[in-house]
């Protein structure tokens, strides 16, 4: 569902609406059970009270059961996005049932008369899980909702009506706009299946945020923070700015949440892994890649179920396109000054050496300040895996590769002449693998010589008490 | 067996305008979206639009919001293309074509109509 | 809008040739890219949708492949009746756009 308002204009400019030909009495709600991965392939309409289609087309009582519920939209036509859901189902769970919840009618409106009709669809939904039911074998908790912003909150609105407990809801990027800070009976919460999982990707403090910004399930996932997604740049999506609009962004950010979970379907063996921090800032300062008490998990179509979290919020960084996995790693870098570093922060990058791959220089983000005299935390992470770490290398950008900062050694050189130099001291850097759970502790390979100045290099290796590790083996292992 | 039929030639005068009509046959007609494909004298083909008979919901390349309009008859199973304040620019071949379940590809196409502007 | 290019205006073989059409698109499309062949005052026929899925009563010559930006139509060992205007389109955002076309023919 792309941007509700956006730069090119009103909504309703946007909008060609059917004329009013009411001829016959037609649902506006349709279900459409994806028979063949062939698009072509019209599939099989499901209505209530109608048991032949079930039986001509093959509908699997005891298989998982997929409803994909899409949201608003901009055109009468269904967006690309459903057709790799779809497929990714059928190619993950070959013998599950995958049914398209139509509702185009009803979402191809004003964006507020399409947030009203949600209701309306849940509705619908639920009354089709009801008279499912009703057959035998067919169990409740083989249903997984999946519903893509509006239709996530659909998705939450079926599963309050029906009668019981729907298995899964997944929500991608649910809709922000009516329902941010909305009772939980207006949106999707976690009380709407026995497990709801979010994946938020457009959220914005400032500004129209498309997607929802607080937490609606049993577990939310930030990917990237939850705002700014790479590969949705603007030279990223427009490749020259000349060939689309910033309403081309919106839609990258926000369907990266489908594709995150398309992601997790057909790349099993690369899994993603969140984890569970307070904020966002928190997570960039690498402070949260703990697995303990269940604060790890798989995101996508792969998480566990964790009923007993509500609203708890997991972050990961990504790749700009699949598959997304990265590798994350934590460094407690602890720095020690003896004279005043001046006002400027240093501007530091890490090489990661491993027995599989190296990394490429990678900064090392500082979120806050650096605080000198006390170990400081960094996240930092690769798109390849470097299997075990055997050496790092340490660099402090030189004064000739930024005039800012150029300017600040002149400023500081100003204003304390008899000290112009800044060195720091650094003999060992502690480093924790989101993904492996593994600690290790590097040196610098001569104590004497662990300082640091602009333009300079420092060199760690494992100390020499060798590996210093917890969790011998990956806590994923359960879980991919 | 699937069948997309257009109506014949035209030949018009700037200004006028024309509807092309796309009689569906051998599916079912409000299961698919109908698009709508210009083909310029010798040139590449371009998408003006498409159109969801179920409902008559439609969507317009931006080039073309102006200048087509898309409809349908459920009970004709036939789909219309109307072109207004007709200039040269709009002398081609148009082509109606059948998308698949989503929309994206097109697997069935009409023979195409002529349209000739001239003065 | 995106835009695919066709890089080759024409492309002369001999048949009984292999031949590989290629087409590039301004930012990742995935794999929602069709080939179309039509020949002369005929109709666009289908030959490949999906970037790889082949379509009944297309002969087995004719393949697809790529993903995201770079993507090829292959054809082999061509035939006389496969000369002709070959074109790609994308259906992964509005508005869907084909390519300028590439014209396959007899050396």
């Known amino acids: 569902s792309p941007v509700p308002f956006g730069p090119e204009g009103r909504l309703e400019d946007k909008l060609h609406k059917p004329k009013a030909t009411q001829t016959e009495v037609k649902p506006s709600v349709r279900f459409n059970l994806r028979t063949s991965k062939d698009p072509e392939h019209e599939g099989c309409y499901l209505s209530v009270g109608h048991s032949q289609p079930l039986e001509d087309c093959s509908f699997n009582m005891t298989a998982k059961t997929f409803f994909i519920i899409h949201g608003w939209t901009m055109s009468g036509i269904f967006e690309n996005w459903l057709h790799k859901l779809v497929s990714a189902l059928h190619t993950r769970e070959k013998d599950a049932n995958v049914v398209v919840v139509d509702w185009l009618p009803l979402a191809h409106q004003l964006y507020t008369d399409a947030v009203n009709n949600t209701r309306v669809v849940g509705h619908s939904i639920a009354r089709m899980l009801d008279w499912l039911q009703e057959k035998d074998d067919f169990s409740l908790g083989n249903v997984h909702l999946i519903g893509y912003s509006l239709g996530a909150h659909v998705a939450g609105y079926a599963g309050n009506f029906v009668k019981g407990t729907v298995g899964r809801i997944t929500g991608l990027d649910p809709a922000g706009p009516m329902f941010e800070g909305a009772d939980i009976h207006k949106r999707l919460s976690p009380d709407d299946a026995d497990f709801v999982d979010v994946l938020h990707t457009y959220t914005r403090s400032f500004g129209l945020s498309i997607g929802i910004q607080m937490p609606v399930g049993h577990i939310d996932i930030y990917p990237n923070g939850g705002d700014f997604q790479p590969g949705c740049g603007l030279n990223d999506v427009l490749g020259s700015i000349a060939y689309g609009t910033i309403t081309e962004v919106v839609k990258c950010e926000h369907e990266r949440a489908v594709h995150l979970f398309v992601d997790s379907l057909v790349n099993q063996d690369k899994p993603s892994f969140a984890f569970q921090c307070t904020d966002s800032n928190r997570f960039k300062k690498g402070i949260c890649l703990s697995c303990r008490k269940n604060r790890c998990n798989n995101i996508g179509y792969n998480a566990k179920k964790m009923r007993k979290k509500r609203n708890s919020k997991m972050y990961l960084k990504t790749r700009a396109g699949m598959p997304f996995k990265v590798y994350h790693y934590q460094l407690k870098v602890h720095m020690f000054s003896y004279n005043n570093s001046g006002d400027t922060q240093p501007t530091l990058y890490i090489t990661l050496y491993g027995s599989n791959a190296d990394s490429q220089n990678l900064p090392l983000e500082i979120v806050e300040k650096i605080e000198l005299n006390a170990t400081n935390t960094f996240l930092v992470y690769t798109e390849e895996d470097l299997g075990d770490l055997l050496k790092m290398r340490l660099t402090w950008e030189g004064v000739a590769h930024s005039w800012y900062n150029l300017w600040n050694e002149f400023r500081n050189y100003l204003s304390q002449p008899s000290n112009p130099s800044r060195e720091l001291y650094i003999r060992r850097i502690r480093v924790k693998s989101g993904e492996t759970q593994r600690k290790v502790t590097f040196c610098t390979q001569d104590p004497t010589k662990s300082s640091i100045s602009p333009g300079q290099e420092l060199w760690f290796h494992k100390c020499q008490d060798g590996w210093k590790m917890k969790n011998k083996t990956s806590p994923f292992v359960n879980l991919a | 067996e699937v069948q997309l039929q257009q109506s014949g030639p035209e030949l018009l005068k700037p200004g006028a305008s024309v509807k092309i009509s796309c009689k569906a046959s051998g599916y079912t007609f409000t299961d698919y979206t109908m698009h709508w494909v210009k083909q310029s004298h010798g040139k590449s083909l371009e998408w003006i639009g498409g159109?969801?008979?179920?409902?008559?919901?439609?969507t317009y390349n931006e080039k073309f919001k102006d200048k087509a309009t898309l409809t349908v008859d459920k009970s004709s199973s036939t789909a219309y293309m109307e072109l207004r304040s007709l200039t040269s620019e709009d002398s081609a071949v148009y082509y109606c074509?059948?998308?698949?379940?989503?929309?994206?590809?097109?697997?069935?196409w009409g023979q195409g109509t002529t349209l000739t502007v001239s003065s | 809008d995106i835009v695919l290019t066709q890089s080759l205006a024409t492309l002369s073989v001999t048949p009984g040739d292999s031949v590989s059409l290629s087409c590039r698109a301004s930012q990742d499309i995935s794999n929602s890219l069709h080939w179309y062949q039509q020949k002369s005052h005929e109709s666009p026929r289908l030959l490949i949708k999906?970037?790889?899925q082949s379509i009944s009563g297309i002969p087995s010559r004719f393949s697809g492949s790529g993903s995201g930006t770079d993507f090829t139509l292959s054809i082999n060992s061509v035939e006389t009746e496969d000369f002709g205007m070959y074109f790609c389109?994308?259906?992964?955002?509005?508005?869907?756009?084909f390519g300028g076309g590439t014209k396959l023919e007899i050396k």
């Open positions: 074509a059948k998308g698949d379940y989503y929309g994206g590809s097109y697997n069935y």
């Open positions: 159109i969801n008979p179920y409902y008559g919901g439609t």
């Open positions: 389109q994308q259906s992964n955002s509005w508005p869907y756009t």
């Open positions: 999906y970037a790889s």
